[in-house]
């Protein structure tokens, strides 16, 4: 069967959609891809909760799923021929949309090593138990299925769509209906956040009367990173209801005029934005939301803030706190890298010293340089080291092999060198003869 939707959860800069349908992983990915997304990533506990929320929404709509233990594809796959790596959180699997490996994982059980076929991951839902934030769906690994044969207990899949930003839902100040159409072709009347490039159709009125008024808006980028509909004031306002309907569509305060008209207002410390509905903190940084050495930076118009970290630090997943960047992961040094708080330090192996072309480079120490040689006699420099040598008649000695010791040729391993007497000298030897004998011209024999 094809994929039916559909449940949608939009949060941050992404929307997650859950679909029921017995599709293979490839068919599911193709379905997400056609609308500009991918099978969902689950890169953190927070993201796992978003995915769980969208699945819970889907399950409320689906009357009966066939299996008690149902599986829903996510975008984690391992290609044929790529082996399991138990040391990694993702075990050698990777996200279909690309992106780096992440530390979060939630495997159902120990994985079996198999490199002979492609493997895909699904979320395992026990439908006999309620979905709780404390009990996130486990990751189940298995075959990826094929058209018409998705695999056992596969009931659907979850897509993820990423956006530049989101708009707030439109505020209605009187009876009416908003229908959002997202860029990924989903229509919904209730979204917590509405993705960039979505359209909103607003039909004002009770529905049974002809006096319905309609409006059309697009969620667009009004200024850098400022996403808005461009509507000003609450929509579908009605003197009949005044502030009594949905607080007049106002974010905070609603003030009625005597003629049935009304205006939105804000509490102390807040100000009304251009849409004449929303209130924003006069200075969102005043509550010191940033931690751990992070600086609070105001966004344009003072509407929002971001935390900025000092050099050598980066924001953690909360986007509020700073954590040390491990610069050594990028291998900035030629030899050894030592990560330090807010930075790093390059070190060289024994026999090398800092220097040479490029940052963090190491060059060979010339141990044999004039006035530096550790050897008693000959010294030869090598890459990262050196070795000593001795003149003829001497051998290397000492624990570190830098000294030269005289060879006693008179007790050499080949036996006596002289026919008669042998006299050892520094670095050499000479032969002698007993009284009455004369040393022959060869310097060894006695005649």
């Amino acid at each position: 069967t094809g994929a039916d939707t559909e449940a949608v959860v939009c949060v941050g800069t992404a929307c997650y959609t859950a679909h029921s349908g017995k599709l293979s992983a490839a068919e599911a990915q193709n379905h997400c891809n056609q609308n500009g997304g991918n099978l969902a990533t689950v890169k953190s506990k927070e993201e796992a909760q978003h995915v769980q929320r969208v699945l819970a929404q889907l399950l409320r709509r689906e009357a009966a799923l066939t299996a008690r233990m149902s599986k829903f594809w996510i975008g984690l796959q391992r290609e044929k021929g790529k082996c399991l790596d138990p040391s990694l959180p993702l075990k050698g699997f990777s996200w279909v949309g690309g992106g780096e490996d992440t530390p979060y994982s939630n495997w159902h059980k120990e994985l079996r090593n198999s490199c002979i076929s492609k493997r895909c991951v699904s979320l395992l839902l026990d439908l006999s138990q309620p979905l709780l934030p404390s009990r996130l769906p486990k990751w189940s690994e298995g075959p990826c299925g094929s058209p018409g044969s998705p695999g056992s207990n596969i009931e659907g899949f979850v897509c993820k769509f990423s956006f530049k930003g989101m708009c707030r839902p439109l505020a209605l100040g009187g009876p009416g209906q908003v229908t959002y159409t997202t860029p990924f072709q989903t229509t919904s009347s209730s979204l917590e956040a509405v993705p960039f490039a979505s359209a909103a159709n607003v039909a004002c009125g009770e529905g049974d009367k002809d006096e319905t008024q309609s409006h059309y808006f697009l969620c667009k980028e009004k200024a850098p990173d400022v996403f808005d509909w461009g509507s000003s004031g609450p929509l579908c306002v009605s003197p009949k209801y005044g502030c009594n309907f949905n607080n007049g569509g106002c974010h905070q305060d609603c003030f009625e005029g005597g003629d049935g008209s009304f205006l939105c207002g804000c509490r102390p410390g807040f100000r009304l934005l251009d849409d004449l509905v929303t209130c924003a903190s006069r200075n969102p940084c005043s509550s010191s939301p940033c931690r751990g050495g992070a600086t609070c930076v105001l966004g344009p118009h003072g509407k929002n803030y971001t935390c900025r970290c000092p050099q050598g630090y980066q924001l953690d997943s909360s986007q509020l706190d700073c954590v040390d960047v491990d610069e050594c992961q990028d291998s900035p040094c030629a030899q050894e890298c030592v990560n330090t708080p807010g930075g790093f330090r390059c070190e060289c192996w024994v026999g090398y010293e800092p220097g040479g072309p490029g940052e963090g480079a190491c060059q060979d120490v010339d141990e044999c340089a004039l006035g530096r040689s550790p050897c008693a006699q000959g010294c030869t420099n090598t890459d990262g080291s050196f070795h000593c040598s001795c003149e003829e008649g001497y051998v290397l000695a000492g624990e570190d092999g830098t000294q030269c010791q005289d060879v006693d040729e008179c007790v050499g391993p080949g036996g006596p060198l002289c026919d008669s007497l042998c006299f050892n000298t520094q670095g050499s030897f000479h032969c002698g003869c007993l009284p009455g004998w004369v040393l022959a011209p060869n310097g060894v024999s006695c005649t």
């Epitope: 667009k220 850098p224 966004g299 900025r308």
Partner: antibody, heavy 118, light 112 residues
Framework: QVQLVQSGAEVVKSGASVKVSCKAS????????LNWVRQAPGQGLEWFGR????????DYNGKFKGRVTLIRDTSTSTVYMELTSLTSEDTAVYYC???????????WGQGTLVTVSS | DIVMTQSPLSLPVTPGEPASISCRFS???????????LYWYLQKPGQSPQLLIY???NLASGVPDRFSGSGSGTDFTLKISRVEAEDVGVYYC?????????FGGGTKLEIK
């Protein structure tokens, strides 16, 4: 290729109004802001409004609010700029300019000279 | 509104020599997303303006690499490494961080 073609020069009386058109082609008309910038003779550039053709959303420079109206016709990919209650200070070349995804004004029309005579 | 001051008003340059134009803004153009929303445009004699540099330092398509942009949150510089005869015209800086978008007063570059 992207093109913005504006209507011809206009000479109008003081106190009257003028309507300048800008026909866009070569890109997705509904998905980009169209800005209007004017340049008085020998002077610099002044932004005075923009429209998002996708839904007709507009923003105006407060200095001109109430005098300027921007409308779009998606069937012909044309934007119209109407300026009312003209004075000699409104004599200028009026440009329509596309705003791109980097917030740059990347394509400019050839300009329309509006001369306000007393 | 964000106000900007451009200098010099006029810049006579010998061909082959470098040139530099400054622009100072009344508030920072550095957004919390790390992007600086500062732009440079050139209006050649008798023509419509054309985009040279976007977001402070990025060269627009088809612009020669002798042009470069740099700066901090409020002070910006457009540099031409070797001026050519075709570079004459009026250079404008502009901000697109907050509405209304605003332009500098312009710097007229002429050949000595």
């Amino acid at each position: 290729q992207v093109q913005l073609v504006q209507s011809g020069a206009e000479v109008v009386k003081s106190g009257a109004s003028v309507k300048v058109s800008c026909k866009a082609s070569g890109y997705a008309f509904s998905s980009y802001w169209l800005n209007w910038v004017r340049q008085a003779p020998g002077q610099g550039l002044e932004w005075f409004g923009r429209i998002y053709p996708g839904d007709g959303d507009t923003d105006y420079n407060g200095k001109f609010k109430g005098r300027v109206t921007l409308i779009r016709d998606t069937s012909t990919s044309t934007v119209y700029m109407e300026l009312t209650s003209l004075t000699s200070e409104d004599t200028a070349v009026y440009y329509c300019v596309r705003g791109d995804g980097y917030w740059a004004m990347d394509y400019w029309g050839q300009g329309t000279l509006v001369t306000v005579s007393s | 509104d964000i106000v900007m001051t451009q200098s010099p008003l006029s810049l006579p340059v010998t061909p082959g020599e470098p040139a530099s134009i400054s622009c100072r803004f009344s508030q920072s153009l550095l957004h919390s997303n790390g992007i600086t929303y500062l732009y440079w445009y050139l209006q050649k004699p008798g023509q419509s303006p054309q985009l040279l540099i976007y977001q402070m330092s990025n060269l627009a398509s088809g612009v020669p690499d002798r042009f470069s942009g740099s700066g901090s949150g409020t002070d910006f510089t457009l540099k031409i490494s070797r001026v050519e005869a075709e570079d004459v015209g009026v250079y404008y800086c502009a901000q697109n961080l907050e509405l209304p978008w605003t332009f500098g007063g312009g710097t007229k570059l002429e050949i000595k």
